[in-house]
Interface confidence: low
């Protein structure tokens, strides 16, 4: 008797790996024998398509080598003209072992910047991505994160981030490892040990010592009063990314010697500088006999800080006092860019008035030191936090503790304005404005409108300025 088709084995979901065989079975009972057709995502599968094999009168559909594009809904439809056509559907889920489609590459990056190591993956189920640094799994922290794409992002790259990395893509079917790549961290040139200032006798030998580090290891050049060093011998050694340069000089005249450490990052250079003075003993008389002269300040760095047409002391222990003293303030100035808005104007005033001291003309031109109270105001009121940080760095050897004109004076060694009001200079920038204590009045005269409170005297310390950094 004629019998309408009945599908006795409904289609089920089939999981298959790429390049494996996948088979759907659609068992049909009917009389006469039905015609069975197959569709994928509602598109008819053609009998002559060589990627498929259709057997058992159409009841078995075999995909001979599964591709990831074969994912979808497969349906069989049976019809023998008796009753209506019947249909059963099932899904093919193409499973795929993890595959790294965009592996990481070697990266060179400057310390402090952001590094991204790519690692794009494919796979089903979607692989999870982790990273290995050296031999250990990489643990994410506040600087390091694995992005949703699988890429590794490192914020504020540090030297210790350098090393060998590989990404690992993992799902239930397997694990894929990328090739090992190298993250190289380059570091701006930095001076570890700056040359120290010397006061020597005429005709003696002096060795200036400058140590710098960076990645790549920097080169060191020496400058004498703004020009390349013309005499003297230089000895250099490099060990553990630290370059050590010694300049030996035969002293016949005073000078300002600058050590410049430079290294290259791609097309750019980074530079660190530190200066030292070499003065000749007879030229360095006690304060009252200081060799020098009074002149109007004509520089640029301090023109907003010093009084208009200020008469400043220019020290002739330098071959070119104006240029040398200007270079000293210039070197220190950049360091002040990072201090707090409260500290900065006070520190700038102290720096400029210390390097370009007020000058008393008279028969012997005499520099007038800053009053102790103003120095203490900077140290303990305006710049307490910064001063403490600098002292800490000095103790740890990151700065020199004594660097002639570049150190702000030891407050305790300065004269007090209560001893002799004319023997020391005041810093008008630090005088309080009663209406708004945080404002600094414009520079009009070198006499304060209100006395700075007599702050307690403190142990001696020096406010050293570290070398400046620049990219050229």
């Amino acid at each position: 008797l004629p019998k309408a088709p009945v599908i006795t084995t409904p289609l089920e979901t089939v999981d298959a790996l790429v390049e494996e065989v996948a088979t759907f079975m659609c068992a049909v009972e009917s009389y006469p024998q039905p015609e069975i057709s197959w569709t994928r995502n509602k598109i008819l599968i053609k009998l002559f398509d060589t990627r498929y094999s259709i057997r058992e009168n159409g009841q078995l559909l075999t995909i001979l080598s599964v591709e990831d594009s074969d994912d979808g809904i497969y349906c069989c439809t049976a019809n023998n003209g008796v009753g209506g056509a019947v249909e059963s559907c099932g899904a093919l889920q193409v499973k795929m072992k993890p595959k790294i489609t965009r592996p990481p590459i070697n990266v060179k990056i400057i310390e402090g910047l952001k590094a991204v190591l790519p690692c794009t993956t494919m796979g089903n189920p979607k692989p999870s991505v982790s990273w290995i640094k050296g031999d250990s799994p990489l643990r994410e922290n506040s600087r390091t994160a694995v992005l949703e794409s699988g890429s590794l992002r490192i914020h504020n790259v540090q030297k210790e981030d350098a090393g060998q990395y590989r990404c690992v893509a993992k799902n239930s079917l397997g694990t894929a490892y990328s090739k090992v790549v190298k993250l190289e961290v380059e570091v701006f040139a930095r001076i570890l040990r700056a040359p120290e200032s010397h006061n020597v006798t005429f005709g003696s030998f002096v060795t200036l010592h400058c140590t710098a580090t960076g990645i790549p290891v920097p080169t060191i050049t020496w400058i004498e009063n703004g020009n390349a060093v013309s005499s003297g011998s230089i000895q250099e050694s490099v060990k553990d990314r630290v370059i050590d340069s010694r300049l030996q000089l035969f002293i016949t005249k005073p000078g300002l010697y600058t050590c410049i450490a430079t290294n290259k990052h791609g097309e750019k250079f980074s530079t660190a500088k530190a200066a030292a003075t070499v003065s000749i003993a007879e030229w360095s008389k006690p304060q009252k006999d200081n060799k020098g002269y009074c002149a109007q300040y004509r520089g640029e760095v301090c023109n907003a800080v010093l009084a208009k047409d200020a008469l400043v002391f220019l020290n002739t222990s330098y071959a070119d006092p104006e240029e040398a003293q200007e270079l000293l303030v210039h070197t220190a100035w950049n360091e002040l860019k990072v201090v707090s808005p409260l500290c900065r104007p006070a520190a700038e005033a102290l720096l400029c008035n210390h390097v370009f001291q007020e000058c008393s003309p008279g028969v012997v031109p005499t520099p007038i030191p800053i009053c102790r109270e103003y120095c203490l105001a900077v140290k303990e009121l305006f710049c307490a936090k910064e001063w403490l940080a600098m002292e800490e760095k000095t103790h740890r050897g990151l700065y020199r503790s004594e660097m002639h004109l570049l150190s702000v004076p030891e407050c305790s060694k300065l004269p007090s304005m209560h001893w002799d009001p004319t023997a020391c200079a005041r810093l008008p920038h630090l005088d309080y404005n009663k209406e708004n204590p945080k404002t600094f009045p414009p520079m009009t005269s070198s006499k304060p409108s209100v006395d700075i409170p007599n702050l307690p005297s403190s142990s001696s310390s020096s406010f050293s300025v570290s070398p400046t950094y620049s990219m050229t």
Epitope: S128, S136, R139, E140, N141, S142, A145
Partner: antibody
């Protein structure tokens, strides 16, 4: 401002269940791992459970495995701790804490104020 | 399960320096344990101080520093302040395959005399 606010604590009998919630705000919740940490009265901190940013895996202290379930709903910016078969030794203030990165085990850089769970008959 | 050990209590004078340690009952603490340090004052939630051995969390004063010394993790407070009186907990990451753990020490009660 980053905030983590726990709720769902209370008194429950031994063998009972509670579900703690932690509502997060002020940061990209779905970019950070989260944890539950507890502190029994007068005692120290004890890590309980952790979950990474995407909820892809879960981790538990041995003594709560099989009884507690950590989960998260990134759309609702909420972390959960389902606690079943509670014992008297589970009595503690339960803190929800944010991890410093996406993983389950970054340092705990932000904490809620805690919710007290008391298991007693 | 590993036990993380800390001094039950320590005291320090204001302005003084004190070092709290964090050890393992079996074996040494290494950088692979990523030692983290937390501070808790009475009635408050804990606060993160140091993560991954020696990195300071933002807003944590520079007087707090972390290190690994010998076979222990250490938290050093240089120039202790009265407000530093609190309980301090270290936590170590123990990762072995899928069996990961984050174990707190018993805490050190620090008194600033």
């Amino acid at each position: 401002e980053l905030q983590l606010v726990e709720s769902g604590g209370g008194l429950v009998q031994p063998g009972g269940s509670l579900r703690l919630s932690c509502a997060a705000s002020g940061f990209t919740f779905d970019d950070y791992g989260m944890s539950w940490v507890r502190q029994a009265p007068g005692k120290g901190l004890e890590w309980v459970s952790a979950i990474p940013w995407n909820g892809g895996s879960t981790y538990y202290k041995e003594s709560v495995k099989g009884r507690f379930t950590i989960s998260r709903d990134n759309a609702k910016k909420t972390l959960y701790l389902q606690m079943n078969s509670l014992k008297s030794e589970d009595t503690a203030v339960y803190y929800c804490a944010k991890r410093s990165g996406r993983i389950a085990f970054g340092a705990l850089d932000a904490w809620g104020q805690g919710t007290l769970v008391t298991v007693s008959s | 399960q590993a036990v993380v050990t800390q001094e039950p209590s320590l005291s320090v004078s204001p302005g003084g320096t004190v070092t709290l340690t964090c050890g393992l009952s079996s074996g040494s603490v290494t950088s692979s344990n990523y030692p983290d340090w937390y501070q808790q004052t009475p009635g408050q939630a804990p606060r993160a101080l140091i993560y991954s051995t020696n990195s300071r969390h933002s807003g944590v004063p520079s007087r707090f520093s972390g290190s690994i010394s010998g076979n222990k993790a250490a938290l050093t407070i240089t120039g202790a302040q009265p407000e530093d009186e609190a309980d301090y907990y270290c936590a170590l990451y123990m990762g072995r395959g899928s069996n990961k753990d984050y174990v707190f020490g018993g805490g050190t009660k620090l008194t600033v005399l």
